[in-house]
Interface confidence: low
């Protein structure tokens, strides 16, 4: 379920692109990163392909978007709020937060200078 | 300053098995993001991409040529390899390897070796 | 596979005028654009990314724009060195695909 952004402007295009993208391998990067490879993660076999396959697979999904810092982060707050809720406890949340601010060096291209992550209501 | 450099025969008989090793000069092989390449031009024509290596393993091929080439990397020794099988004439070229950059809004080939001249012939 | 068209297929122009080259992708390649020079006996040599950018060390009279469909390279004064062929590439998906060359001589 996608969020609801009450952003103005030419923000539209940027989640037109989020949409458009397939943020499912950044996910699953970060959860493999937070909770080990060897570790069973409810929503997928993440078992099945190793963390570093999955990070170039989140960067060449995040390769398709626009080369703003608005979009990539955009992009990250998306996939908080696609992963709040399966995140158990505060520590997860935040290991979560951390992973997810270092995904654009990871991917070798611009970090976001200023991206809000608390894009939950308070649920993350 | 990265440096690339391939090595193999310079002369192939026909029917027979292209193998070439394109040597890396530091740690890179192994880095996120970049795609490691082989790049042929016949003599007085134009740039084919071949197929490209990411360090895991994941390949990706130029469909008219997938059913002969082989590509594969020993990161430990910062080599990537190419075999292409079954040539002809056709397949004589100067040979490049190359390093692709995947970077986000960055997708290039920014650094060749100096190429290396394959000459199928009987 | 998408297909990259380069016109004109040869450019005489004298050194000190501006050269124009056209790469014409189909289907769009968004920005997804490369450029590169290559001498006689040389490997080629990156030159712009993302359809504009300039990479490392190239002269600012290289220039190029584009999106999409349509892309120009333009040199703005041809330097005696500037005379080679030239490529566009692209990568918006795999695989990746060279144009045919452009190349520029002396008049």
């Known amino acids: 379920m996608r969020r609801e952004r009450g952003r103005q402007g030419d923000s539209s295009s940027c989640e037109r692109q989020v949409d458009r993208v397939n943020l499912k391998p950044c996910e699953q990067h970060i959860m493999q990163r937070i909770m080990g490879e060897q570790e069973q993660y409810d929503s997928y076999d993440i078992r099945s392909t190793r963390s570093s396959d999955q990070q170039q697979r989140c960067c060449d999904e995040l390769n398709e978007m626009e080369n703003t810092q608005r979009c990539m982060c955009e992009a990250l707050q998306q996939i908080m709020e696609n992963q709040c809720d399966r995140l158990q406890d505060r520590q997860m949340v935040q290991q979560f937060k951390r992973e997810l601010m270092n995904l654009p060096q990871q991917c070798n291209f611009r970090a976001p200078q200023r991206c809000d992550l608390d894009v939950s209501g308070g649920r993350c | 300053q990265l440096q690339l450099q391939e090595s193999g025969p310079g002369l192939v008989k026909p029917s027979e098995t292209l193998s070439l090793t394109c040597s890396v000069s530091?740690?890179?092989?192994?880095?996120?993001?970049?795609?490691w390449t082989w790049i042929r031009q016949p003599p007085g024509k134009g740039l084919e991409w071949i197929a490209s290596?990411?360090?895991?393993?994941?390949?990706y091929y130029n469909p008219s040529l997938k059913s002969r080439v082989t590509l594969s990397v020993d990161t430990p020794k910062r080599q990537f390899f190419l075999r292409l099988s079954s040539v002809t004439a056709a397949d004589t070229a100067v040979y490049y390897c190359?390093?692709?950059?995947?970077?986000?809004?960055?997708?290039?080939?920014?650094?060749w070796g100096q190429g290396a001249m394959v000459t199928v012939s009987s | 596979e998408i297909v990259l068209t380069q016109s004109p297929a040869t450019l005489s122009l004298s050194p000190g005028e501006r050269a124009t080259l056209s790469c014409r992708a189909s289907?769009?390649?968004?920005?997804?654009l490369a450029w590169y020079q290559q001498k006689p006996g040389q490997a080629p040599r990156l030159l712009i990314y993302?359809?504009?950018q300039r990479a490392t060390d190239i002269p600012a009279r290289f220039s190029a724009s584009g999106s999409g469909t349509d892309f120009t390279l333009t040199i703005d004064s041809l330097e005696p060195e500037d005379f080679a062929i030239y490529y566009c590439?692209?990568?918006?998906?795999?695989?990746?695909?060279f144009g045919g060359g452009t190349r520029v001589e002396i008049k």
């Open positions: 993302d359809a504009s």
């Open positions: 289907p769009s390649v968004g920005r997804f």
């Open positions: 290596i990411y360090y895991t393993g994941t390949t």
């Open positions: 190359a390093r692709y950059l995947d970077y986000v809004w960055l997708r290039a080939f920014d650094v």
């Open positions: 590439q692209h990568r918006s998906n795999w695989p990746v695909t």
């Open positions: 530091d740690d890179s092989i192994s880095t996120p993001s970049y795609f």
